[in-house]
């Protein structure tokens, strides 16, 4: 995640990023909407890797928890919202079937708008 | 990616998402800033999987290519910018060493602001 502040810029929504291990994640939602268990270890050629995920979400302590920064408030209501993407992970479904599935993880914080209705 | 439009909302920045294969991606940048080759297939317990990535970027054809939607233009300049995250991928570095590395992929389109200076 390149930091806009380094270029003298501000984000419309403040976010936080962190590394999360499968040990802490435990479960996730797959592409079909089912809950799956995220396995801690991935077998690789002759060994194991820890499953790690880089997650980004809206900063609940940030300035923008009340609404997005820089919005024209006369015409718009705004809200910072965490959005998700898909990454492949080694998982186990409810029937104990282990396999590589795409799971949803938090990857961004974006601003959504709704038009202000006339009073 | 949940669709804000379904809830009568608009995004400050328009984005497009697509599935990209390693065959199309070919190379990527790893966490240390080095360019690596993304391998097309990943060996799994019963064969091989194609490496796929779910990528989201700013829509170059969208309304927001000239600036973000809903911004207070009296005080702010704005720009929609594609941001990146990290996902693990099977890659080969410049020394032909194959391994699982975190690579950067496009995951979102966010709005960045700069303050308008007094004329």
């Amino acid at each position: 995640h390149s930091d806009p502040a380094r270029r003298g810029e501000l984000s419309v929504c403040d976010s936080i990023s962190e590394w999360v291990t499968a040990a802490d994640k435990k479960t996730a939602v797959d592409m079909s909407g089912g809950t799956v268990t995220v396995l801690e270890k991935v077998p690789v050629s002759k060994g194991q890797l820890k499953q790690y995920f880089y997650e980004t979400k809206c900063n609940p302590m940030g300035y923008t928890k009340e609404g997005c920064r820089g919005i024209d408030k006369r015409h718009w209501n705004s809200q910072c919202r965490t959005t998700q993407s898909y990454v492949r992970a080694l998982t186990m479904d409810s029937k104990k079937r282990i396999g590589w599935r795409f799971i949803r993880i938090d990857t961004s914080c974006v601003c959504t708008l709704t038009i202000k209705r006339g009073r | 990616h949940s669709d804000p439009a379904r809830r009568g909302e608009l995004s400050v920045c328009d984005s497009i998402s697509e599935w990209v294969t390693a065959a199309d991606k070919k190379t990527a940048v790893d966490m240390s800033g080095g360019t690596v080759t993304v391998l097309e297939k990943v060996p799994v317990s019963k064969g091989q999987l194609k490496q796929y990535f779910y990528e989201t970027k700013c829509n170059p054809m969208g309304y927001t290519k000239e600036g973000c939607r809903g911004i207070d233009k009296r005080h702010w300049n704005s720009q929609c910018r594609t941001t990146q995250s990290y996902v693990r991928a099977l890659t080969m570095d410049s020394k032909k060493r194959i391994g699982w590395r975190f690579i950067r992929i496009d995951t979102s389109c966010v709005c960045t602001l700069t303050i308008k200076r007094g004329r």
């Epitope: 962190e18 590394w19 999360v20 291990t21 040990a23 802490d24 994640k25 435990k26 801690e40 690789v44 050629s45 002759k46 060994g47 194991q48 890797l49 820890k50 790690y52 | 966490m31 060493r97 391994g99 975190f102």
Partner: antibody, heavy 119, light 108 residues
Framework: DVQLVESGGGVVRPGESLRLSCAAS????????MNWVRQAPGEGLEWVSA????????YYADSVKGRFTISRDNSKNTLYLQINSLRAEDTAVYYC????????????WGLGTLVTVSS | EIVLTQSPATLTVSPGERATLSCRAS??????LAWYQQKPGQAPRLLIY???TRATGIPARFSGSGSGTEFTLTISSLQSEDFAVYYC??????????FGGGTKVEIK
């Protein structure tokens, strides 16, 4: 700068307990799995225990299983090791070590705290 | 558990000479091996990970090679500050993580 400072060591009798602490600074503590590694006087390094970033996964060497408990308080940026039923063979310098994101090895170590078990 | 055997136990070398340290694994650890340096009274310091990648701030005279079961740490031209004990560590199969017994590099 990353800093890890252990405390809580001392001279104890066999069968007694101790709680070691490791105060971390200079990095986002919750993003890293943390480990304890010990070194008996004049001997090599022995891995003791590990804990995932948010505490969801804990791991122990067979030699300490059931007697040692690893924990962390991310709000205080502190790692702990509760040591019960101490034995003479537990005499060692106990190091707190930060696990890298790149793999399960240790990119930063504390200076250690000495635990001496003697009757 | 995977056993790592380091040899020699002690290596006596003159400053400016090349030092070659060996680490052998009881089974393949792929390239999942790290090397550390430890000086008396100090904590270990990461030198190499992934069998051959130098950690941040480590001088180019340190290099790692090997994969599978045979690994080598080479110090191309020993400086006075390089006299220390060196440990290898595997992270291919865990828990437990395991360390080698160490090689002490002494001044001739």
């Amino acid at each position: 700068d990353v800093q890890l400072v252990e405390s809580g060591g001392g001279v104890v009798r066999p069968g007694e307990s101790l709680r070691l602490s490791c105060a971390a600074s200079g990095f986002t503590f919750k993003n890293h799995d943390m480990n304890w590694v010990r070194q008996a006087p004049g001997e090599g390094l022995e891995w003791v225990s590990a804990i995932s970033g948010r505490g969801g996964g804990t791991y122990y060497a067979d030699s300490v299983k059931g007697r040692f408990t690893i924990s962390r308080d991310n709000s205080k940026n502190t790692l702990y090791l509760q040591i019960n039923s101490l034995r003479a063979e537990d005499t060692a310098v106990y190091y707190c070590a930060r696990e890298s994101i790149w793999g399960i090895f240790f990119d930063y170590w504390g200076l250690g705290t000495l635990v001496t078990v003697s009757s | 558990e995977i056993v790592l055997t380091q040899s020699p136990a002690t290596l006596t070398v003159s400053p400016g000479e090349r030092a070659t340290l060996s680490c052998r694994a009881s089974q393949s650890v792929s390239s999942n091996l790290a090397w550390y340096q430890q000086k008396p009274g100090q904590a270990p310091r990461l030198l190499i990970y992934g069998a051959s990648t130098r950690a941040t701030g480590i001088p180019a005279r340190f290099s790692g090679s090997g994969s599978g079961t045979e690994f080598t740490l080479t110090i191309s031209s020993l400086q006075s500050e390089d006299f220390a004990v060196y440990y290898c560590q595997q992270y291919n199969n865990w828990p437990p993580l395991t360390f080698g017994g160490g090689t002490k590099v002494e001044i001739k």
